[in-house]
Interface confidence: medium
């Protein structure tokens, strides 16, 4: 279902682009799931505009979103997680545009955390470890992680490593000696669920030792 309102308040509705995008987060707050939607055009006048989701819900036919500044948001246990839901932009009872979306295909994981780097002098390598809340979840458990690191002076020269575990080893010889590095990590669903990259974890900074310098554990800066 889609169409444009024709009442006086929205006589210019046909000129507006109501394209929107959404992402879901499953078990983001205990057993509660969330769904966040926003208009792709930041200049859309969102006064009087509401979002509604119908179908593939438990116990209810439809749910209304809460408006939080420029985004629209639902936190609920009522997502069925099988089948497509109809998400509509509405003004009053009139639907301006709708999308059929399977919430399991627009999952955005929570950002990884507790990123750290430890230098192993004997092995001449760096052990990168991080944590993710998804290890404890019932649904989105399997993730692909993207670890990105760069020498701090190289503004946009990131090296990326994809891995499914939460531990990575970087060989010392692949890094510049006596240099400051920035490292960060993000995650994306990798089994059954599909979707988007999480936000990046907070960056961790570490310094590589001088050649032949035994500095032990890398301290955060």
């Amino acid at each position: 279902e889609s169409g444009y309102a024709q009442n006086g308040d929205l006589e210019d509705a046909e000129l507006d682009d109501y394209s929107f995008s959404c992402y879901s987060q499953l078990e983001v707050n205990g057993s509660q799931h969330s769904l966040t939607c926003a208009f792709e055009d930041p200049d859309v006048n969102i006064t009087n505009l509401e979002f509604e989701i119908c179908g593939a819900l438990v116990e209810v036919k439809c749910l209304n979103f809460r408006k939080l500044q420029e985004i629209y948001f639902i936190e609920t246990k009522k997502f069925l997680l099988i089948g497509k839901s109809n998400i509509c932009v509405k003004v009053g009872e009139k639907s301006l545009t709708c999308k059929k979306i399977d919430l399991t295909t627009i999952v955005k994981p929570e950002a990884p955390f507790d990123l750290s780097v430890v230098y192993r002098e004997g092995a001449n390598d760096f052990v990168v470890t991080f944590n993710t809340s998804h290890l404890q979840k019932k649904y989105v458990k399997v993730l692909m992680h993207d670890v990105a690191y760069r020498q701090e002076k190289d503004e946009n020269k990131w090296t990326h490593v994809n891995l499914s575990s939460t531990k990575l080893t970087l060989l010392q010889r692949k890094l510049q000696p006596a240099a400051m590095y920035e490292i960060k990590v993000r995650s994306i669903p990798d089994h059954y669920f599909k979707g988007f990259w999480s936000e990046w974890s907070p960056s961790y900074y570490f310094r590589t030792p001088e050649i032949n310098n035994s500095s032990g554990e890398m301290d955060p800066i």
Epitope: L57, L80, L81, I82, G83, D102, T105, K138, Y192, K194
Partner: antibody, heavy 121, light 109 residues
Framework: EVQLVESGGGLVQPGRSLRLSCAAS????????MHWVRQAPGKGLEWVSG????????GYADSVKGRFTIFRDNAKNSLYLQMNSLRAEDTALYYC??????????????WGQGTTVTVSS | AIQLTQSPSSLSASVGDRVTITCRAS??????LAWYQQKPGKAPKLLIY???SLESGVPSRFSGSGSGTDFTLTISSLQPEDFATYYC???????????FGQGTRLEIK
């Protein structure tokens, strides 16, 4: 008109294989999960298997797990059930059914007329 | 897996009678329950979903109620065409799984 038409049933010996097909029409096939439900002669309904719209969610009854495979071809509006290592207890009328989760819960709102599978030596 | 137990397994009633069939779940399923009617030689037909919502085209003499573990299907005034077998059904969304009750056969007295 929304319609489901099953085919592929027949008489088969124990241990052999059979593939059932279900042709769907009158609705947007790739918006819906689909199911196979069977009914042995004089018995009740038994859910066999289900598959989500994009084939990423699949479930089987314990009685068929490891022997039956459900799959679908959205381009052909078709649902299939590959049945291997058939047993006498698989003898039943096999229905294809469309889900209608938009009603709030998983419900099977459209059923085919069924295709009969007889497993006997 | 959740089990559904229907009672009675069969019952005899007369046209005009009020009939109640119950379905008990082995654990709470909120209102995730549907009811179907099946006549001999025919495919099942959806009657009730969400425990109490009447499917389009189904006569209003059919009604459903209940939540949690105990559910009922009521036919307020039996008509000749209502003599059939009735099944309750629930689902699990992850992994995908559906369960039917064993059925209740409603016969003419």
């Amino acid at each position: 008109e929304v319609q489901l038409v099953e085919s592929g049933g027949g008489l088969v010996q124990p241990g052999r294989s059979l593939r059932l097909s279900c042709a769907a029409s009158g609705f947007t096939f790739d918006d819906h999960a689909m199911h196979w439900v069977r009914q042995a002669p004089g018995k009740g309904l038994e859910w066999v298997s289900g598959i989500s719209w994009n084939s990423r969610g699949i479930g089987y009854a314990d009685s068929v797990k490891g022997r039956f495979t459900i799959f679908r071809d959205n381009a052909k509006n078709s649902l299939y059930l590959q049945m291997n290592s058939l047993r006498a207890e698989d003898t039943a009328l096999y229905y294809c059914a469309k889900d209608e989760y938009s009603r709030g819960y998983y419900v099977l709102d459209v059923w085919g007329q069924g295709t009969t599978v007889t497993v006997s030596s | 897996a959740i089990q559904l137990t229907q009672s009675p397994s069969s019952l005899s009633a007369s046209v005009g009678d009020r009939v109640t069939i119950t379905c008990r779940a082995s654990q709470g399923i909120s209102s995730a329950l549907a009811w179907y009617q099946q006549k001999p030689g025919k495919a099942p037909k959806l009657l009730i979903y969400d425990a109490s919502s009447l499917e389009s085209g189904v006569p209003s003499r059919f009604s459903g109620s209940g939540s949690g573990t105990d559910f009922t299907l009521t036919i307020s005034s039996l008509q000749p065409e209502d003599f059939a077998t009735y099944y309750c059904q629930q689902f699990n969304s992850y992994p995908l799984w559906i369960t039917f009750g064993q059925g209740t056969r409603l016969e003419i007295k």
